[in-house]
Amino acid sequence: RTRSGSQLDGGLVLFSHRGTLDGGFRFRLSDGEHTSPGHFFRVTAQKQVLLSLKGSQTLTVCPGSVQPLSSQTLRASSSAGTDPQLLLYRVVRGPQLGRLFHAQQDSTGEALVNFTQAEVYAGNILYEHEMPPEPFWEAHDTLELQLSSPPARDVAATLAVAVSFEAACPQRPSHLWKNKGLWVPEGQRARITVAALDASNLLASVPSPQRSEHDVLFQVTQFPSRGQLLVSEEPLHAGQPHFLQSQLAAGQLVYAHGGGGTQQDGFHFRAHLQGPAGASVAGPQTSEAFAITVRDVNERPPQPQASVPLRLTRGSRAPISRAQLSVVDPDSAPGEIEYEVQRAPHNGFLSLVGGGLGPVTRFTQADVDSGRLAFVANGSSVAGIFQLSMSDGASPPLPMSLAVDILPSAIEVQLRAPLEVPQALGRSSLSQQQLRVVSDREEPEAAYRLIQGPQYGHLLVGGRPTSAFSQFQIDQGEVVFAFTNSSSSHDHFRVLALARGVNASAVVNVTVRALLHVWAGGPWPQGATLRLDPTVLDAGELANRTDSVPRFRLLEGPRHGRVVRVPRARTEPGGSQLVEQFTQQDLEDGRLGLEVGRPEGRAPGPAGDSLTLELWAQGVPPAVASLDFATEPYNAARPYSVALLSVPEAARTEAGKPESSTPTGEPGPMASSPEPAVAKGGFLSFLEANMFS
């Protein structure tokens, strides 16, 4: 059977597997004129791997909370028993009512795009519901995922998220939109408003067109013991225990304290949806308590003090001191000042010495003062903030926050490339290519201090020499290296980088990038002398910029051959002189030649060679540049892209080929060699490249 290259490239030739897993086919290759010897194309068949998705694919989340995805929710497996690390989920469409993030990465950062089944098993993939401004009873979100693990076929998955006040939520004991309790001065009265008690989320379970006809009925099941509830100035009592959400919203509910002490008070209630005109309606209900705190009228509220962030390394433990949490309260003992965690970060938890291993959500100032309270960092490297509420039990709670910075155990200064300074400019801005600090993540807040300055230049910020700068200034392109001494083509300086309390040093290398145009063109003929002129090396732009004649110094090479000065005419005495230095003018005058040698000690064939040059010009630093070129045995039939001053002796004396000889001192043909037409890519070109020499 014959197949053409175009059929192969068009994807029309298919291999159909049958039988054993290992095998293949033999073939010969022909271009119509030549035929290659037989080849064997090996084919290894793999058993088809199938991905499957188990788990409920539903996640129930408490309003405003964070819920990890678990194996009960999302469990992928493959018929090949693939490692869970290699089962990759891609988030095709993220959540609308919240966000998906990784516990070990910055939760404030960009949305999560990929995660693995292993990360799901580890409980590291978290869905956070963001509370909307409008009340709701139940909301539904979806995540569209694509499961992949080559070579298996991708599988699409939808994860349904139900956010509901119906669910029992440890982090949110109330099923109502708000149940915050009330603070009332002793012997006084205070209005209970929807800022403190609000069941409008129950109403939200009714479609909006009918909502205005519904209400929420509160039935007081246990009355306050130290005061009285009034609705529109009418007292509530066992015989009249009801009030409505609409009355609450209208500000008609009041608690009047009876005086005689500051003990806690409150009431218990049942709340349910009430239909039009008081008719029954199916809907949510809840039984809860509303806390009323009576405060001493002479009470002075505690004053929170400024807080210093806690800093510790990943996976370690650090005590929390008064530097992080303290208050001034003249009428409360430290044991009376209570803190409650409202929201914890994902980088660790608070624990009390002697209080078990688990996280604590309540502690006192006495715990802080005695050093019993500690923060335990998990593997995460991100900063986090504890949102706390603090109260002395006699004043309304005050919000406080405790910032936790996770310090890296080590940092590394990444130097991706030396700083290249354009020769004519003599200065260049540093970028992340030169200086970037990473720990287990990028450190954008890094600061740098010069501990060994450059020899031939300065570091500048805002045009002024500096010995200290920041990563931000680097990223903004504000940190500049400028040569002040034009005697070296390179320089270096050493910096000390500091990021989140950890330091590391690094050396930044500076090189000058030659303002030189280099064109080597196609391969050059071995044994020939070719002319070095501005078509090959050109520092004309540098000459214009510096108003000088650039000078070249040969530092190295060529390995096979030499640079020579050629006589101006055949009558000029003497042969070619060896050259170690030359000028742009020499190039323009056509006075330079490159004798291309043959590699010794091996069979004739293509080879590579190079020249390393140092380029000087007035008022700018020198620069090192190289001219890399390929060589091949001389081919008289081939047009070369450079002027040949002489060709190999053997070629000149070869009979019957006078046209292959080019008189010395006269330019040879300048036509470019045409590129052979070769099919780009595909199976055929793979074979051509690998099987014919």
Epitope: L217, S232, Q252, Q274, G278, A279, S280, V281
Partner: antibody, heavy 117, light 113 residues
């Protein structure tokens, strides 16, 4: 404690429209209550006619729906009943009542309306 | 519509004796949202408006003597006057507030024997 008082003509001719007003005292009509009309033909049982909320939402007895209209005037703290195309069968004592939660918590004294030519 | 029926139409009980009135609804008036029966009992004395006695089938309205009690669930309900007093002579109505239209039973007349 809220008091309700019905007022309106005691005699209405057949095919005309019966109009009654209920004045609420001792409380605001805008408080979260529904306000209702119930009637009782002489020697017979009670029949609910309809209910209105202070915002104007109304519910009517379907058996009378095409003829009954209840409206509220919060500025005067009163609500009204209109029953069109009356016949002798509409002769009754008409009560206004405060609907609280899911019951008729307090009632007016009632007014007898006779439909006769 | 939910149809309410009462039995008996009338009854005469000696002073101090128990009076029992039954009420039946054509469908359940038990609410799933709060587990309450939307069934109320009213007392109407001659020449007076009705007065609320019992709401949610068994909760006595404030100021109502404790000789009045209500029981039952779903569709069958009972009003009991444990020891009839002279001032209890009246017509007693049951009423469902479960769904519109709200409907009353035909009434039960209680007299002293």
């Amino acid at each position: 404690q809220v008091q309700l008082q019905e007022s309106g003509p005691g005699l209405v001719k057949p095919s005309e429209t019966l109009s009654l007003t209920c004045v609420v005292s001792g409380g605001s009509i805008s408080s979260s209550n529904w306000w209702s009309w119930v009637r009782q033909p002489p020697g017979k049982g009670l029949e609910w006619l309809g209910t209105i909320y202070y915002n104007g939402n109304t519910y009517y007895n379907p058996s009378l729906k095409s003829r009954v209209t209840i409206s509220v005037d919060t500025s005067k703290n009163q609500f009204s009943l209109r029953l069109s195309s009356v016949t002798a069968a509409d002769t009754a004592v008409y009560y206004c009542a405060k609907s609280w939660v899911s019951w008729f918590a307090s009632w007016g004294q009632g007014t007898l309306v006779t439909v006769s030519s | 519509d939910i149809v309410m029926t009462q039995s008996p139409d009338s009854l005469a009980v000696s002073l101090g004796e128990r009076a029992t009135i039954n009420c039946k609804s054509s469908q359940s008036v038990l609410s799933s949202s709060n587990n309450k029966n939307y069934l109320n009992w009213y007392q109407q004395k001659p020449g007076q408006p009705p007065k609320l006695l019992i709401y949610w089938a068994s909760t006595r309205e404030s100021g109502v003597p404790d000789r009045f009690s209500g029981s039952g669930s779903g569709t069958d309900f009972t009003l009991t006057i444990s020891s009839l007093q002279a001032e209890d002579v009246a017509v007693y109505y049951c009423q469902q507030h479960y769904s519109v239209p709200f409907t009353f039973g035909p009434g039960t007349k209680v007299d002293i024997k």
